[in-house]
């Protein structure tokens, strides 16, 4: 009996130019003997719906039809029959599909590929055109895929225990595509600062598919006006 | 990282007095508000108080105006709160809590007061 | 004051089963609500702030809904830790009052 495993859930999520292993582990009854068995993956992208042979291996045969692609002969001796694909783009998403050989047996296995991009995000303030005692702050994020993405804007005053989101006076702008697949965003915030407490801290909370955790950036109103902070990093997806 | 450290459990006798503290470290002390929490036993929790750390102002809920005062010593970075004429309904665990960051509010450890006879 | 009423006051659940707690203010609080996680002997933790936000440590299968008066904390599939007790706080204005609180234990 001959058997494929792909990874649980059949989707894989990786990071835009990482080293991205697509797993593909193989179950048989009996040792294998790499010479006399087969490996080919195949891709099948999100927009065409044509499968391509990315690599295959057939005894003392090896090929990789896309740069860099590998599967490691002495990891299949123990059955782990997964694909290797070095600085994976975005356009390599989709479909991958792991097929086992051993004649006469044949076994096979699909997983979907995410390829996601994390955001950068920045905090500007922007002051030309604006009202005395009124300010504009910028949040920027760049730089992420896929396009869904959610920015919100929260303040937390010195008194009470928690945030609140603000939904007022918020602008989100379009998202932008750049050349290379990547989405930006800025959303803005407008603030009459007089009629605001000194010492709350306002935050643009960036939430996107490749973060485990927010990204957030504050400043802080204090008498003197404001105080943009440095951009608070959570971890990215890794 | 932020930290709320309390005092620990007291036993005392109906109509006494007793003063919990809450020593905070990890961040700057003044620039906080302090909130003080009740909770008996088995039940929910109810608000008594805030101080402003910087010693100018607090605010207390009615129920316990007259039962309570809470007093800052910037120098130790430490709130205090006073509860007085002390009943058996007074048996709680009491919580200094501050507000938080992202990953929520701050509270200390509580602190066990039993009034008995 | 404001007064927080929260249902059921106590629930049994298997895990992976899907548990939702109600709260209702007295008057309109906005989005100013938070979910606590209170497990025996140790102080709250906070889950949820502004109605439905998570705080970053907390497991997506804890959400929360609702504005104005009326207020849920959903937990999607339950997980052995989370059988503990559950307040809602109202934080739009002082003094901050909290509901009776929710506890959810092993069928």
């Known amino acids: 009996d001959l058997k494929v495993e792909m990874m649980a859930g059949g989707t894989q999520i990786t990071p835009l130019n990482d080293n991205v292993t697509i797993f593909c582990n193989i179950f048989y009854s009996q040792p294998l003997n790499i010479t006399s068995m087969g490996i080919t993956w195949f891709w099948k992208s999100l927009t065409f719906d044509k499968e391509v042979k990315v690599f295959e291996f057939f005894g003392d045969h090896q090929e990789a039809f896309r740069p860099g692609a590998i599967v490691s002969p002495w990891r299949l001796k123990s059955g782990d029959a997964s694909l290797r694909l070095p600085g994976i783009q975005l356009e390599e998403a989709g479909e991958y599909r792991c097929e086992v050989v051993v004649t006469p047996l044949k076994a096979q296995g699909t997983v979907q590929l995410e390829v996601v991009a994390s955001p950068a995000s920045r905090l500007l303030l922007d002051q030309v055109g604006m009202k005395e005692n009124e300010d504009k702050y910028m949040c920027e994020s760049s730089g992420f895929y896929p396009e869904a993405i959610n920015i919100t804007w929260e303040k937390q005053t010195q008194k009470f225990p928690h945030p609140i989101e603000i939904s007022e006076d918020v602008i989100t702008g379009p998202t932008i595509k750049n050349m290379d697949g990547t989405f930006n965003v800025t959303s803005c915030l407008k603030l009459n600062s007089s009629q605001e407490d000194p010492g709350t801290v306002y935050q643009c909370v960036v939430r996107h598919a490749s973060l485990h955790t927010p990204l957030r950036s504050n400043f802080t109103l204090t008498a003197a006006r404001h105080s943009l902070s440095e951009t608070e990093k959570t971890d990215n997806f890794s | 990282q932020v930290q709320l450290v309390q005092s620990g459990a007291e036993v005392k006798k109906p109509g006494a007095s007793v003063k919990v503290s809450c020593k905070a470290s990890?961040?700057?002390?003044?620039?906080?508000?302090m909130n003080w929490m009740k909770q008996a036993p088995g039940q929910g929790l109810e608000w008594i108080g805030g101080i402003y750390l910087s010693g100018e102002s607090t605010d207390y809920n009615e129920k316990f105006k007259g039962k309570v005062t809470m007093t800052v010593d910037t120098s130790t970075s430490t709130v205090y709160m006073e509860l007085s004429s002390l009943r058996s309904e007074d048996t709680a665990v009491y919580y200094c809590?501050?507000?938080?960051?992202?990953?929520?509010?701050?509270w200390g450890q509580g602190t066990l007061v039993t009034v008995s006879s | 004051d404001i007064q927080m009423t929260q249902s059921p006051s106590s629930l049994s659940a298997s895990v992976g089963d899907r548990v939702t707690i109600t709260c209702k203010a007295s008057q309109n609080v906005g989005k100013y609500v938070a979910w606590y996680q209170q497990k025996p002997g140790k102080a709250p933790k906070s889950l949820i702030y502004?109605?439905?936000n998570r705080y970053d440590a907390v497991p997506s299968r804890f959400s929360g809904s609702g504005s104005g008066t009326d207020f849920t904390l959903t937990i999607s599939s339950l997980q052995p830790e989370d059988f503990a007790t559950y307040f809602c706080q109202q934080y739009i204005s002082y003094p901050l009052t909290f509901g009776a609180g929710t506890k959810l234990e092993i069928k």
């Open positions: 990890g961040y700057t002390f003044t620039s906080y508000w």
């Open positions: 502004s109605a439905s």
């Open positions: 809590t501050r507000r938080g960051d992202y990953f929520g509010d701050f």
